[in-house]
């Protein structure tokens, strides 16, 4: 889980070690702050859970790509 020690900086200290189905994911944000120990991606799921993930992992990159495309596609 992400941890906000001194808001508004949120950091990830551990990454999920399991893939989460891309269909469970609603959005993401990148964590690149120098105040954090590592770069990370925080996914928000459709039921509003926040999960820290490793941006180097392929499933994380695929999920971000999928969410980017979903955002770009206008809803009919």
């Amino acid at each position: 889980q992400p941890d906000a020690i001194n808001a508004p900086v949120t950091c990830c200290y551990n990454f999920t070690n399991r893939k989460i189905s891309v269909q469970r994911l609603a959005s993401y944000r990148r964590i690149t702050s120098s105040k954090c120990p590592k770069e990370a991606v925080i996914f928000k799921t459709i039921v509003a859970k926040e999960i820290c993930a490793d941006p180097k992992q392929k499933w994380v990159q695929d999920s971000m790509d999928h969410l980017d495309k979903q955002t770009q596609t206008p809803k009919t």
């Epitope: 269909q23 469970r24 039921v47 979903q70």
Partner: antibody
Framework: QVQLVQSGAEVKKPGASVKVSCKVS????????MHWVRQAPGKGLEWMGG????????IYAQKFQGRVTMTEDTSSDTAYMELSSLRSEDTAVYYC????????????WGQGTLVTVSS | DIVMTQSPDSLAVSLGERATINCKSS????????????LTWYQQKPGQPPKLLIF???IRESGVPDRISGSGSGTDLTLTISSLQAEDAAVYYC?????????FGQGTKVEIK
């Protein structure tokens, strides 16, 4: 293509435990979320529990809490479901079910394992 | 927990006629951001595991005949068999995968009249 092959039928006495296995092929178990569903004779489908990567842990239906344990042996890509303190109402077919990364719904099912609880 | 309620519990339909099964969820299974309803329909025949027919409430699984369709969103979902064939005699279940615990409807048995 994911394939799920379950262990064979079991006959158990009331109060005993049963452990059903589900062997995954065509995929790595840790890339899946394995769930277990049971069906008593002539009854509907009942979700028992499964691995929830959103919580990073296995979650169980309240009805089975404390009596069921779901585990994984990642070295053999095999999932297990153990149910203890068996009673006659636990007589059912037990299914493992899972989904791929791109789906989220149960698109793969094991063939089912019949567990009969009888004295 | 989201409760799924199917109606009717059973129905007998003549060959070539329409069969309609309703599934009502106690809360919406629609995620508005992607406009998807997290609902599947399964068909089950005796001695077999459930077979996936429909996902996202209306998308047919590969190989499923087009006489079988899913519709609706949110809390009111429907499975329709437009022209019943002998091989359609089975029990049909809806299931939500929006939030855990994943829950099934009680099932609807479709018989040939």
């Amino acid at each position: 293509q994911v394939q799920l092959v379950q262990s064979g039928a079991e006959v158990k006495k009331p109060g005993a435990s049963v452990k059903v296995s589900c062997k995954v092929s065509g995929y790595t178990l840790t890339d899946l979320s394995m769930h277990w569903v049971r069906q008593a004779p002539g009854k509907g489908l009942e979700w028992m529990g499964g691995f929830d990567p959103e919580d990073g842990e296995t979650i169980y239906a309240q009805k089975f809490q404390g009596r069921v344990t779901m585990t994984e042996d990642t070295s053999s890509d095999t999932a297990y479901m153990e149910l203890s303190s068996l009673r006659s109402e636990d007589t059912a077919v037990y299914y493992c079910a899972t989904h791929e990364f791109w789906s989220g719904y149960f698109d793969y099912w094991g063939q089912g394992t019949l567990v009969t609880v009888s004295s | 927990d989201i409760v799924m309620t199917q109606s009717p519990d059973s129905l007998a339909v003549s060959l070539g006629e329409r069969a309609t099964i309703n599934c009502k969820s106690s809360q919406s299974v629609l995620f508005s951001s992607n406009n998807k309803s997290y609902l599947t329909w399964y068909q089950q025949k005796p001695g077999q595991p459930p077979k996936l027919l429909i996902f996202w409430a209306s998308i047919r699984e590969s190989g499923v005949p087009d006489r079988i369709s899913g519709s609706g969103s949110g809390t009111d979902l429907t499975l329709t068999i437009s022209s019943l064939q002998a091989e359609d005699a089975a029990v049909y279940y809806c299931q939500q995968y929006y939030s855990s615990p994943w829950t099934f409807g009680q099932g609807t048995k479709v018989e040939i009249k």
